[in-house]
């Protein structure tokens, strides 16, 4: 049948499983003249045949774990042994079974893990390999603690990341372990392939023994450090110590302060490197970190408190140049005429800060010294002896001395005489309606204008005017601004309106002044005024507490673990209902009820971080409005990527034969976080047999140099397996192979004596 | 032992055709291509062509097609040429020569020849 | 069609001598070079194939080199039985063509 299993050359791929007999030819290729038979060259390993005529067969099964990839090429040669067609390539790719079982690299680990470790960090791996094909579930391995013993309270200390094999406390293991109560645990893990989805997977066990160390990565007490200090500094306050020698310390500054007064040593000893002022900041909370030799935090950052002890060093401030009070006319003895407030930068509430008033001058003495007193705390001025006239002294000068324990300041106060208030508000109307709004009705909306008058003194107390609203809004959603110059009110929205707590307001105002009243003048009704607001209800979307929810987890958590949570509140009081929109990865699910975000697959910080996804409240029944907020999941690093190649390496070659020895380099990578320096690669020849004819040797933590040790190279492909290690906690290696070719060149690249039918050699790396 | 046995010498008229043979033995005939050159006193081999007995098919220098036509007999193990329309230009010996090649080596040559037929166009 | 030229139609030489007879192609041809050896009423033997692979039972005096255009044949050594005409041969690219051939003389 033309097509499917015969037709010309050409390039071509065929899939086969392993381990099958042969029960079919594979292709059966057509000759076009001049051509007159097939020649097969390649990864054959005598399994692969082509007969002359062109019928491409197998002749015993394959195995996939042998050769995954069978890279063929099939050439049309003339009666002369030309090439007149091709090579092409032809790729039979061996498709897995699962006719492996997984097996742990050792029937037996040891670990240890300090106290109070961060959760979720691994502090052990283990480590199953299975020849199958890891692209299927016949090679995709699912770790799982059978037993932890002993297991105290039914409760699990440690869990193990399913994929990876690291094992990791778990919160509650975090918290609880301690070595003077339980010093070693034993943990039982098995390990199936099928993903651990199947009846039918193999599986293996390993026994773990984990012994608990004490942990002396401790936050030390606050520190408390006076201002000002005049002892040498740096001045030692406090230290930290990392649980073994070795480890590199340093401080973090979360405030990012323009001038972070701290360091540290290597001992872990933390100073004060200059005097500190309290008045700049009376507090510092900055960080310990403990690093390894690579830049990794070795654990999490321990949380320095410091504080700055006040001393006098502030002299009392007046509150502005000159202070100026009204006085009536015929004001009564005692009465307040106004506070002076002086402030004081040392700390509140001590003897520091702790202030006294004094009159010191009072010009002009007319009609006499002493008309006015203060009290000595407080800072209120008194009428002392006597009423005042306008007409005599419009105006007086206080020199009043402020004074704390140590300092004093001169404050300046001018008080003006005015007319006496015998006059009140009067509305110009008592009544202003009904007013109806919809409950959304912009913040800052002016709804209504209101006017008084007040036949005082312009522009004095006694004739200015001050709104208030003194019932109907005791959630404060209304405000008045009052025009200085006209004294007209403008009642505006401060807060949003309400309908489902206040679908009416009755309102009243009251017009007063800021000075009082004579005596026997009172404020009657004509200085109270009504309205009544009238607010319809709108349909409001559902709230989010937050704009932004943000997490954070290591990439390795297990599935099911709780990773955050959202909430919102329905303004009509209906239920809501949570969802997850933008879930690329399908990695997350969210609890409708609670907003609880749970993963539901393994986590890949190298697939991007943070992993970003909305979150949807939706009202349940009404008219189901949703609203959207940004849910950002912060997948912090762990070492779960092997090195390899940064980029494809075919088409190496040295010219046969070599005149001395060459050399070519090569570049690693790998996917995971390298913070500080970047990755430190060690690399090495994947087995001890190449060791004869290559070398290789390290430039950089991500170059490596392959040498030739020898000239007398055979004229053919070369496979040259390098192992490379990440160095990480815990180290990850990748095997990579690097084809190099040995060939005859012809200016300077491959050269192999065939052509199309004009006979043009075809010449390539 | 391989041999190939060429026809020794012919003496033709211009204008008329001949037909030379090459017999071999110690081998399969349609095992190898037998191809053809020309070569005329004090110059150079021309390739003429060649046959692959197997199937009959044939490649010709360009030079020479119409002039030469290539013939094998499977059952007397023997090679023909035919020249025609023949003119004292094509006065010279001929040989034919076996192409032996191992493609997994990428060797290619001309590993047995004829002892050459000597053609003489003349009136 | 690619022309293959042998410079030197004759070359004087002494027994004992070393001979180097040239042919350069006009375009390249790789490694797809032979060298054969005539001598007078004879038909050609093959030396060298693939422009530097001696053929089974020829003197390893005979040496082949080049690739791409320039090839070379050299004789170590020479004897006298050595006389011969030496013609190059390209099959990389059809029609195959041979140089126009180099005859060794005594001098």
């Known amino acids: 049948q033309e097509g499917k299993f015969s037709g010309p050359l050409k390039p071509m791929t065929f899939s086969i499983y392993e381990g099958q007999e042969p029960s079919q030819i594979i292709f059966q290729f057509k000759a076009n003249p001049p051509a007159v038979t097939f020649e097969l060259t390649g990864e054959t390993d005598n399994i692969f045949v082509i007969e002359r005529e062109g019928l491409l067969y197998y002749n015993r099964a394959l195995d996939r774990e042998t050769r995954s990839t069978h890279n063929l090429q099939v050439a049309a040669l003339d009666a002369n042994g030309i090439i007149v067609e091709g090579p092409v390539p032809i790729t039979i790719k061996v498709k897995d079974i699962n006719d492996n079982r997984p097996t742990f690299l050792q029937s037996k680990y040891e670990g240890s893990v300090r106290q109070n470790s961060r959760p979720g960090k691994p502090f052990l791996y283990v480590n199953a390999t299975d020849l199958d094909d890891p692209a299927t579930p016949n090679g995709q391995l699912y770790y799982q603690i059978v037993i932890q013993l002993p297991m105290i309270n039914n409760v699990m200390y440690f869990q193990i990341n399913n994929k990876t094999g690291a094992i990791s406390l778990t919160r509650e293991g975090s918290q609880e372990l301690n070595p003077a109560k339980n010093p070693s645990y034993n943990l039982v893990i098995s390990v199936k392939d099928m993903g651990g989805q199947s009846e039918n997977s193999f599986s293996d066990t390993t026994s773990v023994d984990i012994i608990v160390t004490e942990n002396i990565w401790k936050a030390p007490k606050p520190v408390e450090m006076v201002e000002n200090s005049t002892d040498p500094h740096p001045i030692k306050i406090t230290q930290v110590r990392w649980n073994d020698p070795g480890a590199q310390y340093s401080l973090v500054d979360k405030e990012k302060l323009p001038r972070f007064p701290f360091s540290i040593d290597q001992e872990g000893d933390i100073y004060v490197t200059q005097p500190l002022d309290r008045e700049e900041k009376d507090a510092y909370v900055f960080y310990a970190v403990a690093k390894d030799e690579y830049g990794k935090p070795l654990s999490y950052p321990l949380e320095i408190h410091v504080k700055v002890k006040d001393i006098n060093d502030n002299p009392p401030t007046c509150p502005s140049p000159v202070t100026v009070f009204e006085v009536q006319e015929n004001e009564r003895l005692g009465n307040s005429i106004g506070t002076l407030t002086a402030h004081d930068r040392d700390e509140e509430n001590t003897a520091n800060s702790f202030l006294n008033y004094r009159i010191v001058e009072q010009t002009p003495k007319l009609p006499m010294d002493g008309l006015f007193l203060i009290q000595t705390y407080a800072g209120m001025l008194q009428l002392a002896k006597q009423s005042l006239k306008k007409q005599d002294t419009p105006q007086y000068n206080l020199t009043i001395e402020v004074s704390d324990k140590d300092f004093k300041t001169l404050c300046f106060v001018q008080i003006n005489v005015i007319d006496i208030n015998d006059q009140i508000p009067i509305f110009e109307k008592s009544d202003y309606g009904n007013l109806t709004l919809a409950e959304d009705t912009n913040i800052g909306s002016t709804i209504l204008t209101i006017q008084a008058t007040d036949a005082d003194e312009p522009f004095t107390g006694s004739s200015k005017i001050l709104y208030h609203i003194i019932k109907g809004d005791s959630e404060g959603r209304l405000g008045v601004d009052t025009d200085p110059h006209t004294n007209t009110g403008y009642v505006i929205i401060k807060k949003p309106l309400d309908f489902e707590t206040a679908a009416v307001s009755n309102i009243v105002f009251k017009a007063e002044n800021p000075e009082p009243l004579v005596f026997g003048v009172k404020y009657n009704a004509s200085s109270f005024a009504k309205f009544t607001l009238i607010v319809t209800d709108v349909n409001e979307a559902p709230q989010f507490s937050q704009h932004v929810f943000q997490a954070k987890v290591s990439e390795d958590v297990a599935i099911g673990t709780k990773v955050g949570n959202v909430t919102a509140k329905d303004p009509e009081g209906l239920d809501i209902s949570y969802s997850l929109r933008g879930d690329t990865r399908g990695w997350l699910k969210i609890d409708h009820v609670t907003g609880e975000i749970f993963s539901v697959a393994p986590l890949d910080r190298e697939a991007g971080s943070p992993y970003r996804v909305q979150v949807v409240a939706t009202e349940v029944g009404g008219s189901s409005l949703s609203s959207v907020s940004e849910f950002h999941l912060i997948l912090m690093d762990v070492n779960d990527n092997p090195p390899r190649l940064a980029k494809d390496y075919t088409g190496l070659f040295f010219c046969h034969p070599l005149s001395a020895p060459g050399s070519l380099i090569f570049e690693a990578t790998d996917d995971d976080q390298h913070l500080f320096r970047g990755p430190h690669f060690t690399f090495s020849l994947g087995s001890g047999s190449l060791q004869n004819d290559w070398e290789v040797s390290k430039i950089n933590g991500t170059h490596a140099r392959l040498s030739t040790r020898h000239t007398e190279f055979e004229e053919r492909e070369y496979v040259v397996l390098i192992r490379i290690n990440d160095g990480g906690r815990p180290p990850l290696e990748g095997i990579v192979s690097l084809p190099v070719t040995f060939c005859s060149c012809v200016e300077g690249s491959c050269f192999r004596p065939a052509g199309h039918q004009t006979g043009i050699p075809t010449v390539g790396m | 032992e391989v041999q190939l046995q060429q026809s020794v010498a012919e003496l033709v008229k211009p204008g008329a055709s001949v037909k030379m043979s090459c017999k071999v033995s110690g081998y399969t005939l349609t095992d190898h291509t037998i191809h053809w050159m020309k070569q005329r006193p004090e110059q150079g081999l021309e390739w003429i062509g060649y046959?692959?007995?197997?199937?009959?098919?044939?490649g010709y220098n360009e030079k020479f097609k119409g002039k030469a036509t290539l013939t094998a007999d499977t059952s007397s193990s023997t090679a023909y040429m035919q020249l025609n329309s023949l003119t004292s230009e094509d006065s010279a010996v001929y040989f034919c020569?076996?192409?032996?090649?191992?493609?997994?080596?990428?060797?290619?040559?001309?590993?047995?020849w004829g002892q050459g037929t000597t053609l003489t166009v003349s009136s | 069609d690619i022309v293959m030229t042998q410079s030197q139609k004759f070359m004087s030489t002494t027994v004992g001598d070393r001979v180097n007879i040239t042919c350069k192609a006009s375009?390249?041809?790789?490694?797809?070079v032979a060298w054969y050896q005539q001598k007078p009423g004879q038909s050609p033997k093959l030396l060298i194939y693939?422009?530097?692979n001696r053929y089974t039972g020829v003197p390893d005096r005979f040496t082949g080199s080049g690739s791409g255009t320039d090839f070379t044949l050299t004789i170590t050594n020479m004897q006298s039985k050595d006389l011969a005409d030496y013609f190059c041969q390209q099959y990389s690219s059809y029609p195959w063509t041979f140089g126009g051939g180099t005859k060794l003389e005594i001098k």
């Open positions: 046959i692959y007995p197997r199937d009959g098919i044939t």
């Open positions: 020569a076996r192409w032996g090649y191992s493609y997994r080596n990428y060797a290619y040559y001309y590993d047995y």
């Open positions: 375009q390249n041809v790789g490694t797809a």
């Open positions: 693939s422009a530097s």
